[in-house]
Amino acid sequence: KKEDGESTAPTPRPKVLRCKCHHHCPEDSVNNICSTDGYCFTMIEEDDSGLPVVTSGCLGLEGSDFQCRDTPIPHQRRSIECCTERNECNKDLHPTLPPLKNRDFVDGPIHHR
């Protein structure tokens, strides 16, 4: 997994990388295997009803440095992990949802009578 503070651009691999894809298979994938010049990823996020959904697939080199950095997004529970060390390496990635943050449900200051 890439560290949050990492800013170096990913170096191109000399060869294509094959990744498992699930819910995120491009047209050129075969038997749930996609190919990329970048990273394999596995991502977990909450759907509209609050249920965790896991997707996996390929990220092209272009822009994948940013996508793999897993920058927290306000009001969105999501976590992504990326890898390149071997083909289908994302089968072994198991990102977990970040913990729920305590929310202050009070709209304004509380006035006592």
Partner: antibody, heavy 116, light 112 residues
Framework: QVQLQQPGAEVVKPGASVKLSCKAS????????MQWVKQRPGQGLEWIGE????????MYNQKFKGKATLIVDTSSSTAYMQLSSLTSEDSAVYFC?????????WGQGTTLTVSS | DVVMTQTPLSLPVSLGDQASISCRSS???????????LHWYLQKPGQSPNLLIY???NRFSGVPDRFSGSGSGTDFTLKISRVEAEDLGVYFC?????????FGSGTKLEIK
């Protein structure tokens, strides 16, 4: 310089198996996939499959599944293709080829003759 | 499988002439990464193929600049600006976007 060395010819009997070799030199063997391609006279080039020597991951053309098995020996930087249950249809020139995102170097090819 | 259709099958030329070979694919060769993996090879009699052009228009190292590639999507062209004797042989296009990878049937460049 990149070189892929293949034996010039192999003659085998129908029903037998054969193991074709491809010795790589001039580059880091595990940094590239190795592909195998079949060429029969008047029938063009056919992609058999490929193997990534770094993790021995293989991908095959469905047409050659059960016919071809790809393996590597990283200690000698050699790729092998085993062909089984040979028939006259398997008589062809077989090329190994280095692949990153495209094939940039080819072996000279092994002419396989299946004959009794 | 992606079918690669090459035309013409045979191309008789005079030395010094321009030659043009067409390659059409049955599906778009634009990969999900945005790259187009369409390549051109020359095979001389009794030899293995040699890479000329990779990813549509990039000349491989040592390939003379009289060779050029163009196209997009499903339609591609290889041009040789001034044919020399050493250019004679069979030209193949090839795609590595979709598995299984496939090749054109070849175009034989010969002297008129």
């Amino acid at each position: 310089q990149v070189q892929l060395q293949q034996p010039g010819a192999e003659v085998v009997k129908p029903g037998a198996s054969v193991k074709l070799s491809c010795k790589a030199s001039g580059y880091t063997f595990t940094n590239y996939w190795m592909q195998w391609v079949k060429q029969r006279p008047g029938q063009g080039l056919e992609w058999i499959g490929e193997i990534d020597p770094s993790d021995r991951y293989t991908m095959y053309n469905q047409k050659f599944k059960g016919k071809a098995t790809l393996i590597v020996d990283t200690s000698s930087s050699t790729a092998y293709m085993q062909l089984s249950s040979l028939t006259s249809e398997d008589s062809a020139v077989y090329f190994c080829a280095r692949f990153g995102y495209y094939v940039d170097y080819w072996g000279q090819g092994t002419t396989l003759t299946v004959s009794s | 499988d992606v079918v690669m259709t090459q035309t013409p099958l045979s191309l008789p030329v005079s030395l010094g002439d321009q030659a043009s070979i067409s390659c059409r694919s049955s599906q778009s060769l634009v990969h999900s990464t945005g790259n187009t993996y369409l390549h051109w090879y020359l095979q001389k009699p009794g030899q293995s193929p040699n890479l000329l052009i990779y990813k549509v228009s990039n000349r491989f190292s040592g390939v003379p600049d009289r060779f050029s590639g163009s196209g997009s999507g499903t339609d591609f062209t290889l041009k040789i600006s001034r044919v020399e004797a050493e250019d004679l042989g069979v030209y193949f296009c090839s795609q590595s976007t979709h598995v299984p990878f496939t090749f054109g049937s070849g175009t034989k460049l010969e002297i008129k």
